[in-house]
Each structure stands twice: as structure tokens, then as C-alpha cells.
């Protein structure tokens, strides 16, 4: 969390941003909130990106003002216009690109004063893994698949029964480049699996960490997955 204050002495307002990560090809949100104003027409929101000449987005007098928008953001940004009055200056970003990563500034002007805060935005690819029993294999084998990751992650297997065990000798991980030539499909196979055990396939890069669990018993198979972004710090 980054909290910024205005630089004009007593005429300062608090602006708060949250560092976040964007998933390539998906929509992203750059979070920014500020002390609200009573009149929408008095609020100016400017989003800027370090190293970019034009604006990312501008909203003033109750509407978008995009005549100075940088080419790389054309047709790709929107504020939540109905939430500006309550202090939400967050920006929606369409079809996140690797090149969208960087430092953004959320700059606010209201009748109370000015304020700004920076936001670190990371971009990459991350997806939920799915763990299945590989019935085609000669021995009991688990297959962990996740469709989209970038940068290349690490994959670690763990088991509830053999806590602390190193499965690197009995597992094999491969990375297959997807058609857009950036993200990769992750496939990891774990051999010599025992019954009545819960196995976890953990995939991690500097943006996200995802885990796929599978519980294999005589009578049933239970699966669970979750994904966590690693860099959500507020400012």
C-alpha cells in the first residue's frame, strides 16, 4: 500500500494505491483511492506511467479526456465513472501486455487539494493448476497441468504423508511455449505415487504462486486448487 500526500502544504489530499500484477491477455486493475469530493466536476484524475510521454488516462469535469492519451493505451483504459464521486480512481486496463509493467502515478486534484501516489505494476502470466491421476502410465502417476505461465516458474511437489521429502528425482517437469510465443504451458509428472495420500503441485514465479492438491484414496479422488498473487503491497 502506498499512501501519497499532496505537495502543496495545507492543500493536500491522501491518495492510496495498491501494487498489483496483471495477467497477460486478461484485464487488469490499477487500484487508486482518494478522499472524495462532493462535486464530480471538481475532480481530476490523471494516470501516468514512468517513461511514457502521453497520459495513460485522464478523467475531468465528469468525463474522460483522452486527447493526450499515449498510443500504447488507446482503447484499452477506463475508469469506473460512477465510483469516482466516492473516491475510486482505479483504472481498468484491457488485454494486459508484458510492456504494461512499470511504475504508474495516480494523480488527483479536487476542491480540497492535490495528491498522488505511485503504483508498481508487474505483468506476467499465471493460471490455476489441475492435478489428475494419469491412468495411461505404467505405474501410479500424477499429472499437474497449468495452461499459462510467464516468466518460467519453478514446480515443486509435496506430500502430506512424506512431509519434507524431495520429489525432484521422481518427477519430470516440462514447459511448452503457447501459440502467442510468450506464455508457456506447465506440465509436471510425479511417479511412484502411493494411495491414501494428499499430493500438492506448487507452481511459483515472482508474480504468483499456485497450488493444486489431489487426495487419492481407495474409494475417491478429491481435488483443490488456489492461486495467490505475491506482490500486492499498498502504497
Amino acid at each position: 500500500l502506498i499512501i501519497g500526500f499532496g505537495i502543496s502544504g495545507r492543500h493536500s489530499i491522501t491518495v492510496t494505491t495498491v501494487a498489483s500484477a496483471g495477467n497477460i491477455g486478461e484485464d487488469g486493475i490499477l487500484s487508486c483511492t482518494f478522499e472524495p469530493d462532493i462535486k464530480l466536476s471538481d475532480i481530476v484524475i490523471q494516470w501516468l506511467k514512468e517513461g511514457v510521454l502521453g497520459l495513460v488516462h485522464e478523467f475531468k469535469e465528469g468525463k474522460d479526456e483522452l486527447s493526450e492519451q499515449d498510443e500504447m493505451f488507446r482503447g484499452r483504459t477506463a475508469v469506473f465513472a460512477d465510483q469516482v464521486i466516492v473516491g475510486n480512481a482505479s483504472l481498468r486496463l484491457k488485454n494486459v501486455q508484458l510492456t504494461d509493467a512499470g511504475t504508474y502515478k495516480c494523480y488527483i486534484i479536487t476542491s480540497k487539494g492535490k495528491g498522488n501516489a505511485n503504483l508498481e505494476y508487474k505483468t506476467g502470466a499465471f493460471s490455476m493448476p489441475e492435478v489428475n491421476v494419469d491412468y495411461n502410465a505404467s505405474s501410479e502417476t500424477l499429472r499437474c497441468e497449468a495452461p499459462r505461465w510467464f516468466p518460467q516458474p519453478t514446480v515443486v511437489w509435496a506430500s502430506q504423508v512424506d512431509q519434507g521429502a524431495n520429489f525432484s528425482e521422481v518427477s519430470n517437469t516440462s514447459f511448452e511455449l503457447n501459440s502467442e510465443n510468450v506464455t508457456m504451458k506447465v506440465v509436471s509428472v510425479l511417479y511412484n505415487v502411493t494411495i491414501n495420500n494428499t499430493y500438492s503441485c506448487m507452481i511459483e514465479n515472482d508474480i504468483a504462486k499456485a497450488t493444486g492438491d489431489i487426495k487419492v484414496t481407495e474409494s475417491e479422488i478429491k481435488r483443490r486448487s488456489h492461486l495467490q498473487l505475491l506482490n500486492s503491497k499498498a502504497s
Epitope: 468525463k63 474522460d64 483522452l66 492519451q69 488485454n95
Partner: antibody, heavy 119, light 107 residues
């Protein structure tokens, strides 16, 4: 109320040029992009290009060499010019405005102007 | 270019029927699919944007949904004024593209 009104259609000789205008009201050209879409008689919709609030443009690659979209913000008007016309360019040409600045659909359309390419 | 394959190309239905039109994108388009209604000699009208958001003034019988790259427009109870041609379109990546259209006719 948002309105877009096209003009400039009519009969054009093969190999000739076409210049259409789209006069807008009820919104600012510095807030929204304006799209151009055409529809040949009895056929579907085909996207041709867009001019953004900043004045930058994106074109359908199939028309890149012969299409120019421009605007005069002070006159609230967008211009569409296509060169080297052929019979298959006969269509109703529409200008349209996006529903949001992030382009989730075309909410407002002009009435369309018919362009016939024939000798 | 992203292909939007719309089906069926035409259908006959009666007033009160539930009508479903589908559109399949040849690659990922996120939620950037919109649906339009067009009557002869008129400009298209936006019904649904962002895959499932009903545009202002559009009756609640029109709804849109998404499953991966498959998109559906549903008219829950067809009314006489709904007989028209319907198009889907994608605005995820250039060039923006449309489906071939579905003509809804009176049975």
C-alpha cells in the same frame, strides 16, 4: 443525446475515391473513439478502422493501403477516405461510437450512407 | 484475424419461444463480445456488451453469457418486434470482427 450523422455517399467510379463525413453531437471526440463499419448489400458487418480521442488510428489490415481516417475536433466531425474503389466496395458505410472508452461494443451508430461503385 | 462463427445462420420461431444464438471465437477474446440487432434498412442496435451486460433500454428478455470462447445470446420469450438479424462481434483485438449473422424469422 448522442448522435452520429454520415454524409458523402453516392455513386463513385471504379478506381475513384470516396470521402465520407461523420458529424457527431452529444459527446466529445476527445473522450471517445469513432469506428467505421460497412455492410455490403445482403451481407454481414465488416470493421474498417477507428480514430481514437488522441487522433491516432487503427485500420483493418485489408484496407491499410487505401484508407485514411481523420478528424476535426473543433467541427465535431470525423472523415473517412478510401481510394482505388472497386465494385466490391459497394456498401452502406456506418460510423459508430463505443459504449465505453475500453471498447466493449458499439453503442451509437449513424444512419449509414450508401456508396455504390459502378461505371 | 479472429473468426466469430455464428450459428444458426437462420431460424424460424414463434412469439413466446425461447431463442438461443451462439457465437464461437476462433481464439481468446476475453469478455469483449457484443451482440447487435438489425432490421432491414436500419443501422445495428447494441443489445449486449462485455459478453453479458445489457445495454441501456434493452428489454430484460435479452441476455448474454460466456463459456470460454463460446458466447450465447438468449431471447427468453420472443416478441413480434424481435424478428430481425442478430450479429455478434469481438473488440478484443484488431481487426475487430463480426459473426455472419442469424436471421430470426416468423414460423
Amino acid at each position: 443525446e448522442v448522435q452520429l450523422v454520415e454524409s458523402g455517399g453516392g455513386l463513385v467510379q471504379p478506381g475513384g475515391s470516396l470521402r465520407l463525413s461523420c458529424a457527431v453531437s452529444g459527446f466529445s471526440l476527445t473522450s471517445y473513439g469513432v469506428q467505421w463499419v460497412r455492410q455490403a448489400p445482403g451481407k454481414g458487418l465488416e470493421w474498417l478502422g477507428v480514430i481514437w480521442s488522441s487522433g491516432s488510428t487503427d485500420y483493418n489490415a485489408a484496407f491499410l493501403s487505401r484508407l485514411t481516417i481523420s478528424k476535426d475536433t473543433s467541427k465535431n466531425t470525423v472523415y473517412f477516405q478510401m481510394n482505388s474503389l472497386r465494385a466490391e466496395d459497394t456498401a452502406v458505410y456506418y460510423c459508430a461510437r463505443d459504449v465505453t472508452t475500453i471498447v466493449e461494443g458499439f453503442a451509437h451508430w449513424g444512419q449509414g450512407t450508401l456508396v455504390t461503385v459502378s461505371s | 484475424d479472429i473468426q466469430m462463427t455464428q450459428s444458426p445462420s437462420s431460424l424460424s420461431a414463434s412469439v413466446g419461444d425461447r431463442v438461443t444464438i451462439t457465437c464461437k471465437a476462433s481464439e481468446k477474446v476475453g469478455t469483449y463480445v457484443s451482440w447487435y440487432q438489425q432490421k432491414p434498412g436500419k443501422a445495428p442496435k447494441l443489445l449486449i456488451y462485455g459478453a453479458s451486460n445489457r445495454y441501456t433500454g434493452v428489454p430484460s428478455r435479452f441476455s448474454g453469457s460466456r463459456s470460454g470462447t463460446d458466447f450465447t445470446l438468449t431471447i427468453s420469450s420472443l416478441q413480434p418486434e424481435d424478428f430481425a438479424t442478430y450479429y455478434c462481434g469481438q473488440t478484443y483485438s484488431y481487426p475487430f470482427t463480426f459473426g455472419q449473422g442469424t436471421k430470426v424469422e416468423i414460423k
